[in-house]
């Protein structure tokens, strides 16, 4: 899904029986440290030397939802993930580097707390690099924790 | 073998309501989403809405919110259709069709349909 | 909402003829897009998914390709058991949004 194409998407207003109350997870995983903004996430994720993960998605994207499920419920991704930074967006950001092939959605770019965007971690698609589908979740992991290799150690 | 059983053929007057459900069997219920299509006689394939059983989150077709409910129980592993206010052009067989096996939106298996027709 | 806009409507092939449906997106879907066979009184099959999948169980004579906005499902050598109404599906944006549908005759 290309955020270029249609954007602020809205929620269908049917969806909001009563739930657990709104966090920044947005679903993505309750659990978890979620930041608020792309400048929080890069200031902690220098300043305690963890990798930032950035989730871009839309709540009215089918793929959006049903990457965020598999995400949510996977065991392995969640534990994983608490030795990141964490941020997930349904905006873009004015920086260029976390779309470095377009604004498409869901895509997950990984930062390095050197704050070099790690452009080489992609997926499995060769006209969107960096989306993951649900069945991307193993590749998803190991991309995690190629993440976590930092490209310097700061002493 | 994945299953998708649905309820049987309904004879319902304008203005009344119907419940369909869609009982499955053979994957892990909660975490596959739920389609409902529709087919009025003699035309295409319309979507309705889908279901992710495992939290209730829906999204429906802007075309069918108002009167159409999709809902599922996970201790009798069944998503249901509810259809309030009925009209004659409401008339038609509903589908249920399970999402991909790894929670991808395509389509994978569909219930056999269920008729209802609506007639004064 | 999207428009997907089948073609042809309906055809007539011999048996062992190789026979192509189109489907046309009103906007690039990706390959977002999932093909259905449907014979009379009976539910919608899936086919093929993500464009050129074939799901399992399906016979290798069927096959997709395309990406963007045009799509095509092949049959290589038509059966009479592959007499049916075909239709295509596109998944990448709400609403999902259905072709007309292609009916497919023996001549």
């Known amino acids: 899904k290309d955020t270029t194409v249609k954007s602020g998407a809205k929620k269908d207003p049917k969806d909001s029986r009563p739930k657990l109350p709104q966090t920044l997870s947005r679903g993505w995983g309750d659990q978890l440290i979620w930041t608020q903004t792309y400048e929080e996430a890069l200031y902690r994720s220098k300043t305690s030397n963890r990798p930032l993960m950035v989730i871009h998605h839309l709540d009215e994207c089918p793929h959006s939802q049903a990457l965020k499920k598999v995400f949510a419920e996977h065991k392995e991704i969640q534990k994983l993930a608490e030795q990141f930074v964490l941020l997930n967006l349904v905006y873009e950001t004015t920086d260029k580097h976390l779309s470095p092939d377009g604004q498409y959605v869901p895509r997950i770019v990984f930062v390095d707390p050197s704050l070099t965007v790690r452009a080489d971690i992609t997926g499995r698609y060769s006209n969107r690099l960096y989306a993951y589908e649900p069945s991307d979740t193993a590749l998803l992991y190991d991309n995690m924790k190629k993440a976590l290799k930092l490209l310097k150690t700061e002493l | 073998q994945v299953q998708l059983v649905q309820s049987g053929s309904e004879l319902k007057k304008p203005g009344a309501s119907v419940k369909v459900s869609c009982k499955t069997s053979?994957?892990?219920?909660?975490?596959?989403?739920m389609n409902w299509v529709r087919q009025a006689p003699g035309q295409g394939l319309e979507w309705i809405g889908w279901?992710?059983?495992?939290?209730?989150?829906?999204n429906y077709n802007g075309k069918f919110k108002d009167r159409f409910v999709l809902s599922a129980d996970k201790s009798v592993s069944t998503v249901y259709l509810q259809i309030s206010s009925l009209k004659a052009e409401d008339t038609a067989v509903y589908f249920c069709?399970?999402?991909?096996?790894?929670?991808?939106?395509?389509?994978?298996?569909w219930g056999q349909g269920t008729l209802v027709t609506v007639s004064s | 909402d999207i428009q997907m806009t089948q073609s042809p409507s309906s055809l007539s092939a011999s048996v062992g003829d190789r026979v192509t449906i189109t489907c046309k997106a009103s906007?690039?879907?990706?390959?977002?897009l999932s093909w259905f066979q449907q014979k009379p009184g009976k539910a919608p099959k899936t086919l093929i998914y993500?464009?050129?999948r074939l799901v399992d169980g399906v016979p290798s004579r069927f096959s997709g390709s395309g990406s963007g906005q045009d799509f095509t499902l092949t049959i290589s050598s038509l059966q009479p058991e592959d007499i049916a109404t075909y239709y295509c599906?596109?998944?990448?944006?709400?609403?999902?949004?259905f072709g007309g549908g292609t009916k497919v005759e023996i001549k």
């Open positions: 069709a399970r999402g991909g096996y790894d929670g991808s939106p395509w389509l994978s298996y």
């Open positions: 053979g994957y892990v219920f909660s975490r596959s989403w």
């Open positions: 279901i992710y059983p495992g939290d209730g989150d829906t």
């Open positions: 906007q690039d879907i990706n390959s977002y």
């Open positions: 993500r464009a050129n």
């Open positions: 599906l596109q998944y990448d944006e709400f609403p999902f949004t």
